[in-house]
Protein backbone atom coordinates (compact mmCIF):
# COMPACT_ATOMS: atom_id res chain seq x y z
CA UNK A 1 0.00 0.00 0.00
CA UNK A 2 1.57 3.79 -0.71
CA UNK A 3 1.81 6.09 1.60
CA UNK A 4 -1.43 8.35 2.02
CA UNK A 5 -0.77 11.68 0.44
CA UNK A 6 -3.19 14.64 0.28
CA UNK A 7 -3.45 16.34 -2.54
CA UNK A 8 -4.70 20.15 -2.49
CA UNK A 9 -5.41 20.66 -6.87
CA UNK A 10 -5.73 24.25 -7.07
CA UNK A 11 -2.61 26.11 -6.54
CA UNK A 12 -4.52 29.30 -6.20
CA UNK A 13 -8.57 30.19 -5.95
CA UNK A 14 -9.52 33.42 -6.72
CA UNK A 15 -13.11 34.82 -5.53
CA UNK A 16 -15.20 37.48 -5.56
CA UNK A 17 -15.98 39.22 -1.77
CA UNK A 18 -19.16 38.06 -0.64
CA UNK A 19 -19.55 35.07 -2.20
CA UNK A 20 -18.39 30.89 -1.62
CA UNK A 21 -14.64 30.02 -1.37
CA UNK A 22 -14.45 26.04 -2.73
CA UNK A 23 -10.89 24.43 -1.76
CA UNK A 24 -10.24 21.19 -2.73
CA UNK A 25 -8.52 18.42 -1.48
CA UNK A 26 -8.32 14.58 -1.83
CA UNK A 27 -6.81 11.69 0.04
CA UNK A 28 -4.89 8.98 -1.82
CA UNK A 29 -5.72 6.50 0.94
CA UNK A 30 -8.08 5.25 3.64
CA UNK A 31 -4.96 4.35 5.76
CA UNK A 32 -4.32 5.84 8.22
CA UNK A 33 -7.95 6.48 9.90
CA UNK A 34 -8.18 9.78 10.81
CA UNK A 35 -9.77 13.47 10.80
CA UNK A 36 -9.09 16.38 8.15
CA UNK A 37 -8.48 19.69 9.58
CA UNK A 38 -8.02 22.99 7.92
CA UNK A 39 -5.73 25.72 8.64
CA UNK A 40 -5.19 29.16 7.54
CA UNK A 41 -0.99 29.44 7.01
CA UNK A 42 1.23 26.94 8.43
CA UNK A 43 3.38 26.89 11.67
CA UNK A 44 2.75 27.17 15.46
CA UNK A 45 0.39 30.27 14.55
CA UNK A 46 -1.79 28.67 11.98
CA UNK A 47 -5.69 29.67 12.35
CA UNK A 48 -7.92 25.98 12.50
CA UNK A 49 -10.49 26.83 9.81
CA UNK A 50 -12.11 23.27 10.15
CA UNK A 51 -11.82 20.32 11.84
CA UNK A 52 -13.73 17.23 11.13
CA UNK A 53 -13.23 15.59 14.46
CA UNK A 54 -14.91 18.48 16.87
CA UNK A 55 -15.92 21.96 16.81
CA UNK A 56 -18.47 24.81 15.22
CA UNK A 57 -17.17 26.42 11.92
CA UNK A 58 -20.58 27.87 11.00
CA UNK A 59 -18.99 29.55 7.55
CA UNK A 60 -17.60 26.30 6.96
CA UNK A 61 -19.20 23.45 4.73
CA UNK A 62 -17.70 19.84 3.41
CA UNK A 63 -17.82 19.29 -0.11
CA UNK A 64 -18.67 15.17 0.37
CA UNK A 65 -20.68 13.91 2.86
CA UNK A 66 -17.92 12.87 5.41
CA UNK A 67 -19.78 10.23 6.94
CA UNK A 68 -20.16 8.00 3.63
CA UNK A 69 -18.42 5.24 3.40
CA UNK A 70 -14.65 5.22 2.49
CA UNK A 71 -15.00 9.03 1.53
CA UNK A 72 -11.71 10.45 0.69
CA UNK A 73 -13.09 14.08 0.11
CA UNK A 74 -12.38 16.29 2.07
CA UNK A 75 -12.95 19.58 0.07
CA UNK A 76 -14.76 22.39 1.65
CA UNK A 77 -16.65 25.86 1.37
CA UNK A 78 -16.17 28.74 2.74
CA UNK A 79 -19.08 31.40 2.43
CA UNK A 80 -19.61 35.04 2.92
CA UNK A 81 -15.49 35.73 1.40
CA UNK A 82 -14.05 38.95 2.99
CA UNK A 83 -10.86 40.06 2.09
CA UNK A 84 -9.98 39.24 5.54
CA UNK A 85 -9.78 35.66 4.67
CA UNK A 86 -6.91 35.89 2.36
CA UNK A 87 -4.25 33.49 2.82
CA UNK A 88 -3.18 30.16 2.03
CA UNK A 89 -5.02 27.20 3.42
CA UNK A 90 -3.52 23.62 4.31
CA UNK A 91 -5.57 20.56 4.06
CA UNK A 92 -3.59 18.23 6.85
CA UNK A 93 -4.89 15.07 7.56
CA UNK A 94 -4.48 13.24 11.24
CA UNK A 95 -3.71 9.69 12.74
CA UNK A 96 -5.89 8.68 15.20
CA UNK A 97 -3.83 8.98 18.43
CA UNK A 98 -4.61 8.52 22.28
CA UNK A 99 -5.51 10.77 23.38
CA UNK A 100 -5.15 13.00 21.22
CA UNK A 101 -4.89 12.67 16.94
CA UNK A 102 -1.22 13.19 15.74
CA UNK A 103 -0.58 15.44 12.66
CA UNK A 104 0.12 12.97 9.67
CA UNK A 105 0.44 14.99 6.24
CA UNK A 106 -0.05 18.79 5.12
CA UNK A 107 -1.37 19.16 1.77
CA UNK A 108 0.68 21.57 -0.28
CA UNK A 109 -1.74 24.32 0.53
CA UNK A 110 -4.09 26.46 -2.07
CA UNK A 111 -3.77 30.44 -2.03
CA UNK A 112 -7.32 32.28 -1.97
CA UNK A 113 -6.78 35.84 -2.84
CA UNK A 114 -10.06 38.03 -2.23
CA UNK A 115 -11.43 40.25 -5.14
CA UNK A 116 -12.90 42.97 -3.13
CA UNK A 117 -14.43 46.25 -5.08
CA UNK A 118 -13.48 49.63 -4.06
CA UNK A 119 -15.70 51.67 -1.92
CA UNK A 120 -17.18 54.70 -3.16
CA UNK A 121 -14.69 57.26 -3.81
CA UNK A 122 -15.03 60.35 -1.80
CA UNK A 123 -13.28 63.79 -3.28
CA UNK A 124 -13.08 66.50 -0.99
CA UNK A 125 -11.70 69.91 -1.42
CA UNK A 126 -9.98 73.05 0.21
CA UNK A 127 -11.96 74.00 3.77
CA UNK A 128 -12.09 77.43 2.60
CA UNK A 129 -12.63 79.36 -0.50
CA UNK A 130 -10.35 80.22 -3.18
CA UNK A 131 -10.42 82.81 -6.05
CA UNK A 132 -9.58 82.61 -9.81
CA UNK A 133 -6.09 82.09 -10.71
CA UNK A 134 -5.06 80.27 -7.52
CA UNK A 135 -4.52 76.64 -7.20
CA UNK A 136 -6.67 74.47 -4.86
CA UNK A 137 -6.18 70.41 -3.59
CA UNK A 138 -8.49 68.23 -4.28
CA UNK A 139 -8.42 64.58 -2.60
CA UNK A 140 -10.01 61.46 -3.26
CA UNK A 141 -9.90 58.27 -1.25
CA UNK A 142 -11.28 54.71 -2.04
CA UNK A 143 -11.08 51.62 0.50
CA UNK A 144 -11.13 48.02 0.87
CA UNK A 145 -9.92 46.78 -2.58
CA UNK A 146 -8.19 43.62 -3.34
CA UNK A 147 -5.78 42.83 -5.13
CA UNK A 148 -3.76 45.91 -5.09
CA UNK A 149 -3.71 47.15 -8.86
CA UNK A 150 -5.77 49.99 -9.41
CA UNK A 151 -6.05 53.44 -11.57
CA UNK A 152 -7.21 56.61 -10.37
CA UNK A 153 -7.85 59.63 -12.93
CA UNK A 154 -8.60 63.04 -12.00
CA UNK A 155 -10.92 65.38 -14.18
CA UNK A 156 -11.98 68.72 -14.59
CA UNK A 157 -15.44 68.89 -16.72
CA UNK A 158 -14.56 65.93 -18.86
CA UNK A 159 -10.72 67.02 -19.19
CA UNK A 160 -8.17 65.00 -17.77
CA UNK A 161 -6.23 66.35 -15.27
CA UNK A 162 -2.36 65.53 -15.32
CA UNK A 163 -1.31 67.36 -11.57
CA UNK A 164 -2.13 64.80 -8.90
CA UNK A 165 -0.19 62.55 -6.36
CA UNK A 166 -1.24 58.85 -5.83
CA UNK A 167 -0.39 56.42 -2.62
CA UNK A 168 -1.59 52.97 -2.80
CA UNK A 169 -1.56 51.61 1.08
CA UNK A 170 -0.27 49.20 2.44
CA UNK A 171 2.69 49.04 0.43
CA UNK A 172 3.52 45.70 1.09
CA UNK A 173 0.99 42.45 1.45
CA UNK A 174 -2.31 43.03 2.89
CA UNK A 175 -5.74 41.71 2.78
CA UNK A 176 -7.32 44.67 1.18
CA UNK A 177 -5.91 48.30 0.23
CA UNK A 178 -6.65 51.82 0.30
CA UNK A 179 -6.00 54.70 -2.68
CA UNK A 180 -5.37 57.96 -1.51
CA UNK A 181 -4.81 61.08 -4.62
CA UNK A 182 -4.27 64.48 -4.00
CA UNK A 183 -5.15 66.85 -7.54
CA UNK A 184 -4.29 70.40 -7.69
CA UNK A 185 -6.45 72.38 -9.97
CA UNK A 186 -6.29 75.90 -11.43
CA UNK A 187 -9.47 77.93 -10.43
CA UNK A 188 -11.20 80.24 -13.29
CA UNK A 189 -13.68 82.71 -12.84
CA UNK A 190 -16.44 80.54 -14.82
CA UNK A 191 -15.69 77.39 -12.52
CA UNK A 192 -19.38 77.65 -10.49
CA UNK A 193 -20.84 74.97 -12.65
CA UNK A 194 -17.33 72.97 -13.13
CA UNK A 195 -17.02 69.54 -11.55
CA UNK A 196 -14.02 67.77 -10.39
CA UNK A 197 -14.17 63.72 -10.53
CA UNK A 198 -12.20 61.27 -9.28
CA UNK A 199 -12.63 58.24 -11.26
CA UNK A 200 -11.20 54.84 -9.98
CA UNK A 201 -11.16 51.69 -11.89
CA UNK A 202 -10.44 48.32 -10.51
CA UNK A 203 -10.52 44.46 -11.66
CA UNK A 204 -13.90 44.35 -10.00
CA UNK A 205 -15.68 46.29 -11.25
CA UNK A 206 -15.86 45.10 -14.74
CA UNK A 207 -14.84 47.88 -16.83
CA UNK A 208 -17.39 50.20 -15.21
CA UNK A 209 -15.55 52.44 -13.21
CA UNK A 210 -16.26 54.44 -10.01
CA UNK A 211 -16.63 57.95 -9.63
CA UNK A 212 -16.67 60.52 -6.94
CA UNK A 213 -17.33 64.26 -7.75
CA UNK A 214 -16.68 67.81 -6.27
CA UNK A 215 -18.45 70.48 -7.24
CA UNK A 216 -16.30 73.53 -7.79
CA UNK A 217 -19.56 76.27 -6.44
CA UNK A 218 -18.45 74.52 -2.87
CA UNK A 219 -14.41 75.97 -3.48
CA UNK A 220 -14.32 78.90 -5.48
CA UNK A 221 -14.93 82.88 -4.50
CA UNK A 222 -16.08 84.60 -7.45
CA UNK A 223 -14.83 88.93 -6.17
CA UNK A 224 -17.62 91.08 -7.24
CA UNK A 225 -16.69 94.02 -9.76
CA UNK A 226 -18.50 97.62 -8.49
CA UNK A 227 -19.07 100.16 -10.82
CA UNK A 228 -20.77 103.24 -9.08
CA UNK A 229 -23.17 105.56 -11.38
CA UNK A 230 -25.10 109.07 -11.26
CA UNK A 231 -28.35 108.42 -12.97
CA UNK A 232 -30.43 110.80 -14.92
CA UNK A 233 -32.29 113.17 -12.35
CA UNK A 234 -35.29 111.83 -11.22
CA UNK A 235 -36.51 115.26 -10.23
CA UNK A 236 -35.33 118.74 -9.99
CA UNK A 237 -33.65 118.22 -6.67
CA UNK A 238 -33.18 114.93 -6.54
CA UNK A 239 -29.96 111.99 -7.92
CA UNK A 240 -30.28 108.39 -8.48
CA UNK A 241 -26.78 106.80 -7.29
CA UNK A 242 -26.46 103.11 -8.55
CA UNK A 243 -23.96 100.71 -7.60
CA UNK A 244 -23.93 97.38 -9.73
CA UNK A 245 -22.44 94.45 -8.51
CA UNK A 246 -21.26 92.02 -10.72
CA UNK A 247 -19.78 88.62 -11.31
CA UNK A 248 -19.88 87.95 -7.69
CA UNK A 249 -20.24 84.25 -6.20
CA UNK A 250 -21.27 82.91 -3.93
CA UNK A 251 -24.53 85.11 -3.65
CA UNK A 252 -23.52 86.19 0.37
CA UNK A 253 -22.96 89.94 -0.06
CA UNK A 254 -23.75 92.58 2.21
CA UNK A 255 -23.87 96.26 0.77
CA UNK A 256 -23.23 99.68 2.93
CA UNK A 257 -23.67 102.95 1.35
CA UNK A 258 -21.03 105.58 3.34
CA UNK A 259 -22.33 109.33 2.65
CA UNK A 260 -18.93 111.46 3.12
CA UNK A 261 -17.64 108.60 5.22
CA UNK A 262 -20.87 107.93 7.50
CA UNK A 263 -22.98 104.79 7.23
CA UNK A 264 -26.25 105.91 5.53
CA UNK A 265 -27.31 102.30 4.61
CA UNK A 266 -26.70 98.70 4.80
CA UNK A 267 -28.74 96.05 2.81
CA UNK A 268 -28.16 91.94 1.93
CA UNK A 269 -27.90 91.02 -1.19
CA UNK A 270 -31.68 89.77 -1.73
CA UNK A 271 -33.08 89.45 -5.70
CA UNK A 272 -30.03 88.57 -7.46
CA UNK A 273 -29.79 87.24 -11.22
CA UNK A 274 -27.55 84.98 -12.14
CA UNK A 275 -25.57 84.62 -15.20
CA UNK A 276 -25.28 81.88 -17.29
CA UNK A 277 -21.78 81.02 -15.61
CA UNK A 278 -23.19 80.98 -12.58
CA UNK A 279 -21.96 84.13 -10.63
CA UNK A 280 -25.08 86.88 -9.80
CA UNK A 281 -25.16 90.33 -10.42
CA UNK A 282 -27.07 92.72 -8.02
CA UNK A 283 -27.62 96.45 -7.92
CA UNK A 284 -28.68 98.99 -5.35
CA UNK A 285 -29.77 102.42 -5.51
CA UNK A 286 -29.71 105.83 -3.60
CA UNK A 287 -31.57 108.71 -4.18
CA UNK A 288 -30.30 111.55 -2.73
CA UNK A 289 -31.84 114.73 -2.16
CA UNK A 290 -29.05 117.42 -3.66
CA UNK A 291 -30.58 120.31 -2.19
CA UNK A 292 -29.89 119.32 1.39
CA UNK A 293 -26.26 119.85 0.22
CA UNK A 294 -24.09 122.85 0.47
CA UNK A 295 -20.85 120.95 -0.83
CA UNK A 296 -20.04 118.25 -2.93
CA UNK A 297 -20.93 114.80 -1.11
CA UNK A 298 -18.43 111.96 -1.95
CA UNK A 299 -20.84 108.60 -2.48
CA UNK A 300 -19.58 105.22 -1.42
CA UNK A 301 -20.64 101.76 -2.25
CA UNK A 302 -19.18 99.07 0.19
CA UNK A 303 -19.23 95.48 -0.27
CA UNK A 304 -18.54 92.74 2.54
CA UNK A 305 -18.73 89.87 -0.19
CA UNK A 306 -18.57 85.99 1.21
CA UNK A 307 -16.71 87.11 4.86
CA UNK A 308 -14.27 88.80 2.86
CA UNK A 309 -12.34 92.86 3.61
CA UNK A 310 -14.93 95.09 2.31
CA UNK A 311 -14.04 96.77 -0.93
CA UNK A 312 -15.72 99.73 -2.47
CA UNK A 313 -16.35 101.95 -4.84
CA UNK A 314 -16.55 105.96 -4.32
CA UNK A 315 -18.64 108.52 -6.54
CA UNK A 316 -18.37 112.33 -6.44
CA UNK A 317 -21.57 113.87 -6.45
CA UNK A 318 -21.01 117.54 -7.22
CA UNK A 319 -23.98 120.00 -6.00
CA UNK A 320 -22.62 123.44 -6.92
CA UNK A 321 -24.63 122.77 -10.01
CA UNK A 322 -27.90 122.76 -8.49
CA UNK A 323 -30.09 125.61 -7.05
CA UNK A 324 -30.09 125.01 -2.92
CA UNK A 325 -33.16 125.17 -1.24
CA UNK A 326 -32.80 126.81 1.82
CA UNK A 327 -34.43 125.61 5.26
CA UNK A 328 -35.00 122.31 3.70
CA UNK A 329 -33.44 120.27 6.69
CA UNK A 330 -35.88 117.65 7.32
CA UNK A 331 -35.78 114.44 6.30
CA UNK A 332 -37.53 113.41 2.71
CA UNK A 333 -39.43 109.88 3.02
CA UNK A 334 -37.90 106.55 1.91
CA UNK A 335 -39.65 105.58 -1.35
CA UNK A 336 -38.08 102.37 -1.52
CA UNK A 337 -36.25 99.78 0.39
CA UNK A 338 -33.28 100.66 -1.86
CA UNK A 339 -33.91 104.40 -1.95
CA UNK A 340 -32.56 107.04 0.62
CA UNK A 341 -32.65 110.67 1.12
CA UNK A 342 -30.20 112.55 2.10
CA UNK A 343 -30.85 116.35 4.22
CA UNK B 1 -11.44 13.07 23.81
CA UNK B 2 -14.18 10.49 22.34
CA UNK B 3 -16.07 9.30 25.34
CA UNK B 4 -19.39 7.05 24.47
CA UNK B 5 -21.44 6.96 27.58
CA UNK B 6 -24.32 4.17 28.10
CA UNK B 7 -26.25 3.54 31.53
CA UNK B 8 -24.82 0.25 33.12
CA UNK B 9 -28.08 -1.82 33.28
CA UNK B 10 -31.86 -1.86 32.05
CA UNK B 11 -34.27 -4.40 33.63
CA UNK B 12 -37.06 -4.95 31.64
CA UNK B 13 -40.49 -7.30 31.86
CA UNK B 14 -40.88 -9.67 28.77
CA UNK B 15 -42.96 -7.73 25.99
CA UNK B 16 -42.51 -4.56 27.23
CA UNK B 17 -40.11 -2.43 25.26
CA UNK B 18 -36.84 -0.74 26.48
CA UNK B 19 -34.81 2.40 24.68
CA UNK B 20 -30.90 2.37 25.18
CA UNK B 21 -29.06 5.51 25.26
CA UNK B 22 -25.50 6.56 24.42
CA UNK B 23 -24.51 9.77 24.74
CA UNK B 24 -21.54 11.27 22.69
CA UNK B 25 -18.76 13.53 23.62
CA UNK B 26 -15.06 14.45 22.31
CA UNK B 27 -16.10 14.45 18.93
CA UNK B 28 -18.44 16.22 16.12
CA UNK B 29 -21.63 13.89 16.99
CA UNK B 30 -22.61 14.15 13.56
CA UNK B 31 -19.67 13.80 11.85
CA UNK B 32 -19.66 9.74 12.25
CA UNK B 33 -21.62 6.99 11.89
CA UNK B 34 -22.92 5.05 15.62
CA UNK B 35 -22.86 1.19 15.23
CA UNK B 36 -25.10 -1.22 18.06
CA UNK B 37 -23.56 -4.64 19.13
CA UNK B 38 -24.94 -7.02 21.27
CA UNK B 39 -23.07 -9.46 23.22
CA UNK B 40 -24.99 -12.40 24.70
CA UNK B 41 -23.77 -13.59 28.00
CA UNK B 42 -20.43 -15.95 27.50
CA UNK B 43 -21.40 -15.40 23.51
CA UNK B 44 -19.69 -13.59 20.78
CA UNK B 45 -20.67 -10.07 19.22
CA UNK B 46 -24.06 -9.32 17.49
CA UNK B 47 -23.52 -6.75 14.62
CA UNK B 48 -27.05 -4.85 15.45
CA UNK B 49 -27.75 -1.72 13.18
CA UNK B 50 -25.69 1.68 12.33
CA UNK B 51 -26.86 5.18 12.19
CA UNK B 52 -25.47 8.36 10.64
CA UNK B 53 -26.09 11.68 13.27
CA UNK B 54 -26.25 13.59 10.37
CA UNK B 55 -29.40 12.61 8.72
CA UNK B 56 -30.35 9.58 10.77
CA UNK B 57 -29.73 7.42 7.38
CA UNK B 58 -29.51 3.31 9.01
CA UNK B 59 -28.78 0.18 8.01
CA UNK B 60 -29.88 -2.73 9.62
CA UNK B 61 -28.94 -6.16 9.97
CA UNK B 62 -32.08 -8.15 9.23
CA UNK B 63 -32.35 -10.41 11.69
CA UNK B 64 -32.89 -7.19 14.09
CA UNK B 65 -34.61 -5.19 11.65
CA UNK B 66 -38.31 -5.96 13.30
CA UNK B 67 -36.81 -5.92 17.08
CA UNK B 68 -34.45 -3.01 16.92
CA UNK B 69 -35.21 1.11 15.90
CA UNK B 70 -32.74 3.23 16.05
CA UNK B 71 -32.31 7.19 16.26
CA UNK B 72 -30.81 10.21 17.57
CA UNK B 73 -31.09 13.48 19.24
CA UNK B 74 -28.19 16.07 17.63
CA UNK B 75 -29.49 18.29 20.21
CA UNK B 76 -28.33 16.68 23.14
CA UNK B 77 -25.70 14.47 20.81
CA UNK B 78 -27.41 11.13 22.07
CA UNK B 79 -28.38 7.97 20.08
CA UNK B 80 -30.89 5.45 21.16
CA UNK B 81 -31.63 2.40 20.22
CA UNK B 82 -35.00 1.12 21.36
CA UNK B 83 -35.62 -3.05 21.91
CA UNK B 84 -39.10 -4.55 21.37
CA UNK B 85 -41.82 -7.39 22.25
CA UNK B 86 -38.80 -8.47 24.91
CA UNK B 87 -38.25 -11.94 25.61
CA UNK B 88 -35.19 -13.45 27.45
CA UNK B 89 -33.31 -13.73 24.05
CA UNK B 90 -33.02 -9.82 24.37
CA UNK B 91 -31.01 -10.61 27.31
CA UNK B 92 -27.69 -8.94 26.57
CA UNK B 93 -25.23 -6.27 26.58
CA UNK B 94 -25.92 -3.88 24.07
CA UNK B 95 -22.57 -1.86 23.00
CA UNK B 96 -22.67 1.13 20.90
CA UNK B 97 -19.46 2.11 18.88
CA UNK B 98 -18.19 5.07 16.91
CA UNK B 99 -16.59 4.41 13.51
CA UNK B 100 -14.05 6.76 13.13
CA UNK B 101 -12.53 6.01 9.62
CA UNK B 102 -16.32 6.13 7.81
CA UNK B 103 -15.07 2.32 7.19
CA UNK B 104 -18.18 0.41 8.79
CA UNK B 105 -15.64 -0.34 11.81
CA UNK B 106 -15.84 0.75 15.30
CA UNK B 107 -13.26 2.46 16.57
CA UNK B 108 -14.30 3.93 19.90
CA UNK B 109 -16.91 1.63 22.45
CA UNK B 110 -19.45 2.90 24.95
CA UNK B 111 -18.82 0.41 28.34
CA UNK B 112 -22.23 -1.16 27.30
CA UNK B 113 -25.45 -1.66 28.78
CA UNK B 114 -26.52 -5.27 30.10
CA UNK B 115 -30.48 -5.82 29.64
CA UNK B 116 -32.06 -8.07 31.32
CA UNK B 117 -35.40 -9.02 30.37
CA UNK B 118 -37.07 -10.74 33.47
CA UNK B 119 -40.76 -10.95 34.79
CA UNK C 1 -24.43 -12.05 3.56
CA UNK C 2 -20.52 -12.59 4.10
CA UNK C 3 -19.87 -14.93 6.53
CA UNK C 4 -17.12 -15.18 8.70
CA UNK C 5 -15.25 -18.03 9.57
CA UNK C 6 -12.55 -18.05 12.66
CA UNK C 7 -10.29 -20.92 14.04
CA UNK C 8 -9.69 -22.25 15.88
CA UNK C 9 -12.31 -21.63 18.81
CA UNK C 10 -9.55 -21.12 21.57
CA UNK C 11 -5.84 -21.55 21.94
CA UNK C 12 -3.33 -21.72 24.38
CA UNK C 13 -0.12 -20.01 23.51
CA UNK C 14 3.18 -20.15 25.42
CA UNK C 15 4.25 -17.04 27.14
CA UNK C 16 7.07 -15.53 24.16
CA UNK C 17 5.95 -17.73 21.60
CA UNK C 18 3.50 -17.06 18.55
CA UNK C 19 -0.28 -17.26 19.03
CA UNK C 20 -2.20 -17.12 15.11
CA UNK C 21 -5.71 -16.77 14.27
CA UNK C 22 -7.47 -17.31 11.21
CA UNK C 23 -10.13 -15.85 9.78
CA UNK C 24 -12.15 -16.94 6.51
CA UNK C 25 -15.14 -15.27 4.80
CA UNK C 26 -17.56 -16.83 2.84
CA UNK C 27 -16.55 -14.17 -0.25
CA UNK C 28 -13.95 -11.92 -0.63
CA UNK C 29 -14.17 -8.80 1.16
CA UNK C 30 -11.58 -6.93 -0.96
CA UNK C 31 -12.02 -3.87 -2.89
CA UNK C 32 -10.36 -1.25 -4.61
CA UNK C 33 -7.22 -2.41 -3.35
CA UNK C 34 -8.28 -2.35 0.45
CA UNK C 35 -9.13 -5.43 2.61
CA UNK C 36 -12.18 -4.56 4.37
CA UNK C 37 -11.07 -6.80 7.94
CA UNK C 38 -10.80 -5.60 11.16
CA UNK C 39 -9.77 -7.66 14.33
CA UNK C 40 -11.07 -6.73 18.10
CA UNK C 41 -9.59 -7.75 21.47
CA UNK C 42 -12.24 -8.31 24.22
CA UNK C 43 -10.96 -8.89 27.75
CA UNK C 44 -13.67 -10.13 30.35
CA UNK C 45 -16.37 -7.14 31.40
CA UNK C 46 -14.87 -4.86 29.03
CA UNK C 47 -16.49 -3.47 25.60
CA UNK C 48 -13.86 -4.95 22.44
CA UNK C 49 -11.25 -2.72 21.50
CA UNK C 50 -9.97 -2.48 17.64
CA UNK C 51 -6.80 -3.94 17.16
CA UNK C 52 -6.22 -3.84 13.61
CA UNK C 53 -7.91 -1.85 10.47
CA UNK C 54 -8.25 -2.71 6.60
CA UNK C 55 -6.41 -6.31 7.33
CA UNK C 56 -2.86 -4.96 8.24
CA UNK C 57 -2.82 -1.36 10.07
CA UNK C 58 -2.36 -1.55 13.47
CA UNK C 59 -4.77 0.68 15.61
CA UNK C 60 -3.30 4.03 17.70
CA UNK C 61 -1.78 3.03 20.47
CA UNK C 62 -1.72 -1.02 19.58
CA UNK C 63 1.53 -2.95 20.45
CA UNK C 64 3.88 -3.91 17.44
CA UNK C 65 3.59 -7.31 18.47
CA UNK C 66 0.38 -7.66 16.68
CA UNK C 67 0.11 -7.67 12.72
CA UNK C 68 -2.55 -8.39 10.20
CA UNK C 69 -2.32 -10.02 6.86
CA UNK C 70 -3.87 -11.20 4.19
CA UNK C 71 -5.82 -10.59 1.46
CA UNK C 72 -9.46 -11.81 -0.67
CA UNK C 73 -10.88 -13.92 1.67
CA UNK C 74 -8.31 -15.22 4.36
CA UNK C 75 -6.99 -13.05 6.86
CA UNK C 76 -4.22 -13.79 9.65
CA UNK C 77 -4.03 -12.10 13.05
CA UNK C 78 -0.50 -12.97 14.63
CA UNK C 79 0.74 -11.79 18.39
CA UNK C 80 4.55 -12.34 18.87
CA UNK C 81 5.57 -12.77 21.41
CA UNK C 82 2.71 -13.28 23.06
CA UNK C 83 2.17 -11.32 26.92
CA UNK C 84 0.07 -12.14 29.69
CA UNK C 85 -1.84 -9.27 28.86
CA UNK C 86 -2.60 -10.82 25.75
CA UNK C 87 -5.43 -13.39 27.17
CA UNK C 88 -8.54 -12.40 25.47
CA UNK C 89 -10.90 -13.24 22.84
CA UNK C 90 -9.84 -12.04 19.64
CA UNK C 91 -12.94 -11.22 16.68
CA UNK C 92 -12.63 -10.12 13.04
CA UNK C 93 -15.38 -8.18 11.48
CA UNK C 94 -15.49 -7.21 7.53
CA UNK C 95 -17.19 -4.36 6.89
CA UNK C 96 -17.19 -5.37 2.55
CA UNK C 97 -21.29 -5.83 2.54
CA UNK C 98 -23.15 -4.51 5.98
CA UNK C 99 -20.71 -5.53 9.07
CA UNK C 100 -20.48 -9.32 10.74
CA UNK C 101 -18.65 -10.57 13.47
CA UNK C 102 -16.41 -13.43 13.27
CA UNK C 103 -17.51 -16.81 16.05
CA UNK C 104 -14.57 -15.53 18.16
CA UNK C 105 -11.13 -17.36 19.04
CA UNK C 106 -10.30 -17.62 22.43
CA UNK C 107 -6.63 -16.98 23.45
CA UNK C 108 -5.48 -18.62 26.57
CA UNK C 109 -1.70 -17.80 28.13
CA UNK C 110 0.32 -20.63 29.58
Known amino acids: EEELQVIQPDKSVLVAAGETATLRCTATSLIPVGPIQWFRGAGPGRELIYNQKEGHFPRVTTVSDLTKRNNMDFSIRIGNITPADAGTYYCVKFRKGSPDDVEFKSGAGTELSVRAKPSAPVVSGPAARATPQHTVSFTCESHGFSPRDITLKWFKNGNELSDFQTNVDPVGESVSYSIHSTAKVVLTREDVHSQVICEVAHVTLQGDPLRGTANLSETIRVPPTLEVTQQPVRAENQVNVTCQVRKFYPQRLQLTWLENGNVSRTETASTVTENKDGTYNWMSWLLVNVSAHRDDVKLTCQVEHDGQPAVSKSHDLKVSAHPKEQGSNTAAENTGSNERNIY | QVQLQQPGTELVRPGASVKLSCKAS????????INWVKQRPGQGLEWIAM????????HYNQIFKDKATLTVDKSSNTAYMQLSSLTSGDSAVYYC????????????WGRGTSVTVSS | DIVLTQSPASLAVSLGQRATISCRAS??????????IFWYQQKPGQPPKLLIY???NLDSGVPARFSGSGSGTDFTLNIHPVEEEDAATYYC????????FGGGTKLEIK
Open chain 3, 93 to 100: QHSRELPT
Open chain 3, 54 to 56: LAS
Open chain 2, 97 to 108: AMDYGSLYAMDY
Open chain 3, 27 to 36: KSVSSSGYNY
Open chain 2, 26 to 33: GYTFTNYW
Open chain 2, 51 to 58: IDPSDSET
